[in-house]
């Protein structure tokens, strides 16, 4: 991480070294206030790469839900609704930050993890592999 | 948050109301170890609603960079390569969590945020609105 | 009831740049695309590029492609066309018009702003 | 780009007799998807363009139904079945099939 000289108004820490244990107020602030949620929801299902949702769940984890993206065809799906398979639908992937507890169970200590969660899928070219 | 009861091996804990301070630690663990980045490492480029990449950096948040996708085009690209404008390139949009130094330039005090970031993007049949 | 009302006419220098604004009203932004279009003085439509507000993203005919940048204003429901480079063949009326795929086309124009490259 | 050549470029009608613009696209305007896209449009002096015509054949909203449009693949017809003088102007086709969308280079008709 960056090194910030530290404000005489901050919160106390014993360990100013990696791996560091800092306070994170779980009070989520939200970014997204002008964002319609409405308008991407059913890009799954208008995409020419269409998907499904899988509800992940973990009570050891924050956020306990997570939604993973599975591809609904190995193909793309044309004009006329049909698949072509000389397109590709494929996840888009995305590393995550989550809180993990630890040790488990316990409500007020966890750990930074990074996990891989697929968000959508999109139709590609395939990649042509020349036989030798 | 959902209730779990604690261990009495949890460190200890004086709040335990929202919006409640937990410790974290912020030793990344990463579960995304069979996974090879590669793979999906030229989708931005293969894909029929292909996106660039761009930086959004910010030193008080961790992680301080972050990705965003923004589709090279309103369009979607066709086999001939030329764009079809009655098909739409649409960033695959998703909540993520961050830490926010909290207060500003604390090395050891966040609070959780959500962003929202563009993932990449995918090729959707347009919405058509019926002209009154 | 809709209406696309642009920026009054400019008069430029030649290598200078022009942006020409186009606010909406009457119908909901996001929900429709804003193509460009421009007439040179006694000559025919040529079109420029368009936009999707809701997103910002941008196709462009390829013979303005580096000189041409359309944005849009989501919170004033405006669309904005800049041209650089400006050289006296660009001296035109330049249209916004508001495409819905149920036309297909543009099927609500502003009224045009006349722009000028003299020097 | 597509090109698409009007015929004729200009026009001189009596005031209730009917009038013909040929349209010409040099590559097939339908789409994938099935529709045409091919317009029409009339820019009445010192106006903006209207759209009249669009997919081939439908009228807009609040367009007469003296004014009709027909054609496929490359081949286009607007028809005025009784022009009038409000008519007057420069007529444009249009196609938005494919990248960049194009025009005809206008048909000008004018009242006898």
């Known amino acids: 991480g960056i090194a910030i000289p530290r404000n005489s108004g901050c919160p106390n820490s014993e360990d100013k070294n990696f791996p560091r244990t800092v306070m994170v107020n779980l009070n989520i602030h939200n970014r997204n206030t002008s964002t319609n949620p409405k308008r991407s929801s059913d890009y799954y299902n208008r995409s020419t790469s269409p998907w499904n949702l899988h509800r992940n769940e973990d009570p050891e984890r924050y956020p306990s839900v997570i939604w993973e993206a599975k591809c609904r065809h190995l193909g793309c799906v044309k004009a006329d609704g049909n698949v072509d398979y000389h397109m590709n639908s494929v996840p888009i992937q995305q590393e995550i930050l989550v809180l993990r507890r630890e040790p488990r169970h316990c409500p007020n200590s966890f750990r930074l993890e990074k996990i891989l969660v697929s968000v959508g899928c999109t139709c590609v070219t395939p990649i042509v592999h020349h036989v030798a | 948050g959902i209730a779990i009861p604690r261990n009495s091996g949890c460190p200890n804990s004086e709040d335990k109301n929202f919006p409640r301070t937990v410790m974290v630690n912020l030793n990344i663990h990463n579960r995304n170890t069979s996974t090879n980045p590669k793979r999906s490492s030229d989708y931005y480029n293969r894909s029929t609603s292909p996106w660039n990449l761009h930086r959004n950096e910010d030193p008080e948040r961790y992680p301080s960079v972050i990705w965003e996708a923004k589709c090279r085009h309103l369009g979607c690209v066709k086999a001939d390569g030329n764009v079809d404008y009655h098909m739409n390139s649409v960033p695959i949009q998703q909540e993520i969590l961050v830490l926010r130094r909290e207060p500003r330039h604390c090395p050891n005090s966040f609070r959780l945020e959500k962003i929202l970031v563009s993932v990449g993007c995918t090729c959707v049949t347009p919405i058509v609105h019926h002209v009154a | 009831q809709v209406q696309l009302v642009q920026s009054g006419a400019e008069v430029k220098k030649p290598g200078s740049s022009v942006k020409v604004s186009c606010k909406a009203s009457?119908?909901?932004?996001?929900?429709?695309?804003i193509s460009w279009v421009r007439q040179a003085p006694g000559q025919g439509l040529e079109w420029m590029g368009v936009?999707?507000?809701?997103?910002?993203?941008?196709d462009y005919n390829q013979r303005f492609k580096g000189r041409v940048t359309i944005t849009a204003d989501e919170s004033t429901s405006t669309a904005y066309m800049e041209l650089s480079s400006l050289r006296s063949e660009d001296t035109a009326v330049y249209y916004c018009?508001?495409?819905?795929?149920?036309?297909?086309?543009?099927?609500?124009w502003g009224q045009g702003t006349l722009v000028t490259v003299s020097s | 780009d597509i090109v698409m050549t009007q015929t004729p470029l200009s026009l001189s009608v009596t005031p209730g007799q009917p009038a013909s613009i040929s349209c010409r696209s040099s590559?097939?305007?339908?789409?994938?998807?099935?529709?045409?896209?091919l317009h029409w449009y009339l820019q009445k002096p010192g106006q903006s363009p209207q759209l009249l015509i669009y997919?081939?054949?439908n009228r807009f909203i609040g367009v007469p139904d003296r004014f009709s449009g027909s054609g496929s693949g490359t081949d286009f017809t607007l028809k005025i079945s009784r022009v009038e003088a409000e008519d007057v102007g420069v007529y444009y086709c249009?196609?938005?099939?494919?990248?960049?969308?194009?025009f005809g280079q206008g048909t000008k008709l004018e009242i006898k």
């Open positions: 936009i999707n507000p809701e997103y910002g993203t941008t």
């Open positions: 590559q097939s305007l339908k789409h994938s998807r099935g529709n045409t896209f």
């Open positions: 249009s196609q938005s099939t494919h990248y960049p969308f194009t």
């Open positions: 018009a508001r495409y819905d795929y149920f036309t297909g086309t543009g099927a609500y």
């Open positions: 009457g119908y909901s932004f996001t929900d429709y695309h």
């Open positions: 997919k081939v054949s």
